[in-house]
Interface confidence: medium
């Protein structure tokens, strides 16, 4: 039977407001609202917490019965939808011990694990996996790319009691490995032997100058020489123009700097590798994965452009249950969500096309009207001129 420590799907209307607590650490934290957004797969099931104010910090958390993950697997899972086409903002969660004062949660509140997507401009599009180990926040050494489109995505972190981990996006593995290898929790197992140094006669040169090679006697030639084809102009006046000097040209016989040919170095020993020894500072920690106490899940974020929706939170000890839960929530509505978005996009495109067409027709009608007015004006002018001509007496007409 899986242990479900925390599950939140926001299926009871405003009920969430009694389970989630706003931090009062700052007076101007952004407000979360319950919404399924502008497009969705299922209007009710896809309701989640949506950030609603631009350029704000958000600090909201929910508590649950405290538990320890010692000796068992920990799975943290939730969905994130950046329907605002996010440019800078967090989409991650923090797991805190139950000692957290939820009304005072803020960016420096000590957490156990931080996990989830983070986007900021073109430079940051990553999934954070940060563990607090002995009071220090330790970041993963790998770059895990997050999704940056407008659709809902499922993020899963699995931490196992054998000190291995797995990160999944949309129920597909994107990263896995060992905690010890992929984070710098512990000092390195091996260090360079401080007592070892490269022997003085160690030769790392693969090639050397051939000692038998010597520069040919006719090698050294000037780089530039007077142009042998140049002639002094006939009108050159040495008194007036000074002594005539032919222009210089590149010497075709110039060979540049002579270098002896290279041969294999008979004394070459290869690159010296500093020998390593076991690091006396290193001692394995089989319980890196373990925390005594989890009691609060928090959203502690900054967003430039609001609109992100968080939903389908799950903390459990059962990987299979989490996968199943993901498929029953995100999995069931993702296709319909895309369908609705595509339909909206198509409607928008048609609307814009229609507006363009209408505008062009109006412009053409205006142009036509202008042309007709112009034609009428020209006809009026001609009629006017004819009338004036008819009014002029005969003899005066000849004089005109």
């Amino acid at each position: 039977e899986p242990a479900v420590y925390f599950k939140e799907q926001f299926l009871d209307g405003d009920g969430w407001t009694s389970r989630w607590i706003e931090s009062k650490h700052k007076s101007d934290f952004g407000k979360f609202v319950l919404s399924s957004g502008k497009f969705y797969g299922d209007e009710e099931k896809d309701k989640g917490l949506q950030t609603s104010q631009d350029a704000r910090f958000y600090a909201l958390s929910a508590s649950f019965e405290p538990f320890s993950n010692k000796g068992q697997t920990l799975v943290v899972q939730f969905t994130v939808k950046h329907e605002q086409n996010i440019d800078c903002g967090g989409g991650y969660v923090k797991l805190f011990p139950n000692s957290l004062d939820q009304t005072d949660m803020h960016g420096d509140s000590e957490y156990n694990i931080m996990f989830g997507p983070d986007i900021c401009g073109p430079g940051t599009k990553k999934v954070h996996v940060i563990f607090n180990y002995k009071g220090k926040n330790v970041l993963i050494n790998k770059d895990i790319r997050c999704k940056d489109d407008e659709f809902t995505h499922l993020y899963t972190l699995i931490v196992r009691p054998d000190n291995t981990y797995e990160v999944k996006i949309d129920n597909s593995q994107v990263e896995s490995g060992s905690l010890e290898d992929d984070w710098d929790f512990l000092p390195p197992k091996k260090i360079k032997d401080p007592d070892a140094s490269k022997p003085e006669d160690w030769d790392e040169r693969a090639k050397i100058d051939d000692p038998t090679d010597s520069k040919p006697e006719d090698w050294d030639k000037p780089e530039h020489i007077p142009d042998p084809d140049a002639k002094k102009p006939e009108d050159w006046d040495e008194e007036m123009d000074g002594e005539w000097e032919p222009p210089v040209i590149q010497n075709p016989e110039y060979k540049g700097e002579w270098k002896p040919r290279q041969i294999d170095n008979p004394d070459y020993k290869g690159t010296w590798i500093h020998p390593e020894i076991d690091n006396p500072e290193y001692s394995p920690d089989p319980s890196i994965y373990a925390y005594d106490n989890f009691g609060v899940l928090g959203l502690d974020l900054w967003q430039v452009k609001s609109g992100t929706i968080f939903d389908n939170f799950l903390i459990t000890n059962d990987e299979a249950y989490a996968e199943e839960f993901g498929n029953e929530t995100w999995g069931v509505t993702k296709a319909a969500e895309k369908q609705m978005k595509d339909k909206q996009d198509e409607e928008q495109r048609l609307k814009e096309e229609e507006e363009d067409k209408k505008r062009k027709e109006e412009e053409e009608a205006e142009d036509k009207e202008d042309d007709e007015d112009k034609d009428e004006d020209e006809e009026d002018e001609e009629d006017k001129e004819e009338d004036e001509e008819e009014d002029v007496p005969g003899q005066a007409k000849d004089e005109l």
Partner: nanobody
Framework: QVQLQESGGGLVQPGGSLRLSCTAS?????FGWYRQAPGKQREFVAN???????RYSDSVKGRFTISRDNAKNTVYLQMNILKPEDTAVYYC?????????????WGQGTQVTVSS
Amino acid sequence: QVQLQESGGGLVQPGGSLRLSCTASGSIAAFGWYRQAPGKQREFVANMYVGGSIRYSDSVKGRFTISRDNAKNTVYLQMNILKPEDTAVYYCNALVRFEGRNDDYWGQGTQVTVSS
């Protein structure tokens, strides 16, 4: 600690232009301009990242241009074809990010009034 200083606000006729400046001290991940009209929520106008990518709100697209002088650590907002609805206090924002931590800093605001 990042200090921000805005300037360039004022009274301008509809259709006119203004250029706002914001000078910062410190290392910035993103600069943004926001505005707040009387009785309304503060709203996003434009922002620019260190990498150079830029974003505008739909209401100012094509009229406003954000730019940055890295040597002076200054960000500008060139506002053209101003409309009465652009009247607001304009705030400069600087975002400093470090390993999942965010700190944002705000200027004191500069008033822009568009009126004939």
